[in-house]
Every structure is written in structure tokens, then in C-alpha cells.
């Protein structure tokens, strides 16, 4: 008798979320910094929310948060939340550190 092959698709809320930073987590002022919310989810994340370490939501809702030019005032810890049709998940905190260039320090 012929047997049928079945595929079981498991849906789950976003998990293993993390914030990655490019070019790194320590960036000189005036350069650009990109924070990316990475996750494992099925179905894929449909909505992203970004938060600072005071748990204030930020006005960014895409997977990537681009800061250009980056300022010392952007220094801090960030986390992201991903949402799909199953539920939500959140990342741990990741810290972005912005430091003054030698030229800026020399002018002060």
C-alpha cells in the first residue's frame, strides 16, 4: 500500500531574541550604528518594538534600528520585542557605548 508523507509545521512565538550591533557595541560619535533584532520565530516576526533600559518604547518598529550620526546621548542599553501571530518574545539587554573622538576631546 502507498504511504503518504505528512509535514507537521510547528508554530511558535519569537524566541532566542538578541540585539546585535554593527559595527560593534562601542562606536565613535559621528559614525553610524545599526542595532538588529535577531530571532527565531514561526511564522516570522511581523512587528518589532524597541525599548531603552528604562523600559521606554522607542519610535522604531523595524527589525533594524539605524543611528546615524550616532551621538553620545545614544549610549545605553537596548532591548527588542518581536511579535508574530502566536505571541511575543523579548531579548536581553545589549549595551551601546558611544565615545568622543580624539578631535572632539581636543576641542573641548
Amino acid at each position: 500500500t502507498a504511504s503518504k508523507a505528512w509535514t507537521l509545521e510547528v508554530l511558535y512565538a519569537p524566541r532566542r531574541l538578541r540585539v546585535s550591533m554593527s559595527p560593534g557595541d562601542q562606536v565613535m560619535e559621528g559614525k553610524s550604528a545599526t542595532l538588529t533584532c535577531e530571532s527565531d520565530a514561526n511564522p516570522p516576526v511581523s512587528h518589532y518594538t524597541w525599548f531603552d533600559w528604562n523600559n521606554q518604547s522607542l519610535p522604531y518598529h523595524s527589525q533594524k534600528l539605524r543611528l546615524e550620526p550616532v551621538k553620545v546621548q545614544h549610549s545605553g542599553a537596548y532591548w527588542c520585542q518581536g511579535t508574530n501571530s502566536v505571541g511575543k518574545g523579548r531579548s536581553p539587554l545589549s549595551t551601546l557605548t558611544v565615545y568622543y573622538s580624539p578631535e572632539t576631546i581636543g576641542r573641548r
Epitope: E29, N54, V72, G76, Y99, I105
Partner: nanobody, 110 residues
């Protein structure tokens, strides 16, 4: 220009405790303060940071062993390090609102 003066550090045996402190010459402390470290041949990495509201974030390696604190009035940020391990050996740098200090050596012997 903000001057950061670091103190503390030194040589300690594994399992021991040590504290490092940093004082800023001007009244900043409005964005983020913290401690970073750089071991020989490695990149500088974040150890612990704190903001003016008192929110903190620790590296996984520091969680549960190190405690960061700040005194806004005295313009100081301190790091209490307990249960030190040889892999904690590094130059520890203070960070305050965009400025890094010159660093202070912490050596943990086995």
C-alpha cells in the same frame, strides 16, 4: 574637557575581592557611566554600566559577582568585584558620558 581619575585595582588572589572607583572632574553623569576592561590581546569589553536613573546592565561574566554603583553628588562610579577569577585579569577603564579613563590594572593570581 572631562578628566576621569581611576583608583583601586591591584593584585589579588583568585576568590578574593577588589574595588575600583572613578571620579569625574566635571558634573556630567547624565547619560551613562560604567566600567570596561581589556585583557592582553583582546578587545575592550563592557563589564557593567549604569545610567542616571540607576538602571544597570552587566556582562554575563560579571553578573552575580560584580556590582556597579554611582554617586551623582560626588561624581563617582565604582565597581565592587567579588569571587575574582584569573580570567578577570585586565586593564579596567572607567567610562562617563562619552569619555574613557586611562585605565587601572587588575591582576588576579591563581
Amino acid at each position: 574637557q572631562v578628566q576621569l581619575v581611576e583608583s583601586g585595582g591591584g593584585l589579588v588572589q583568585a576568590g578574593g575581592s577588589l574595588s575600583v572607583s572613578c571620579t569625574a572632574s566635571e558634573s556630567t553623569f547624565s547619560i551613562m557611566m560604567g566600567w570596561f576592561r581589556q585583557a592582553p590581546g583582546k578587545q575592550r569589553e563592557m563589564v557593567a554600566v549604569i545610567n542616571s536613573a540607576g538602571s544597570t546592565n552587566y556582562a554575563d561574566s560579571a553578573e552575580g559577582r560584580f556590582t556597579i554603583s554611582r554617586d551623582l553628588a560626588k561624581k563617582t562610579v565604582s565597581l565592587q568585584m567579588n569571587s575574582l577569577k584569573p580570567e578577570d585579569t585586565a586593564v579596567y577603564y572607567c567610562y562617563v558620558d562619552g569619555y574613557f579613563g586611562q585605565g587601572t590594572q587588575v591582576t588576579v593570581s591563581s
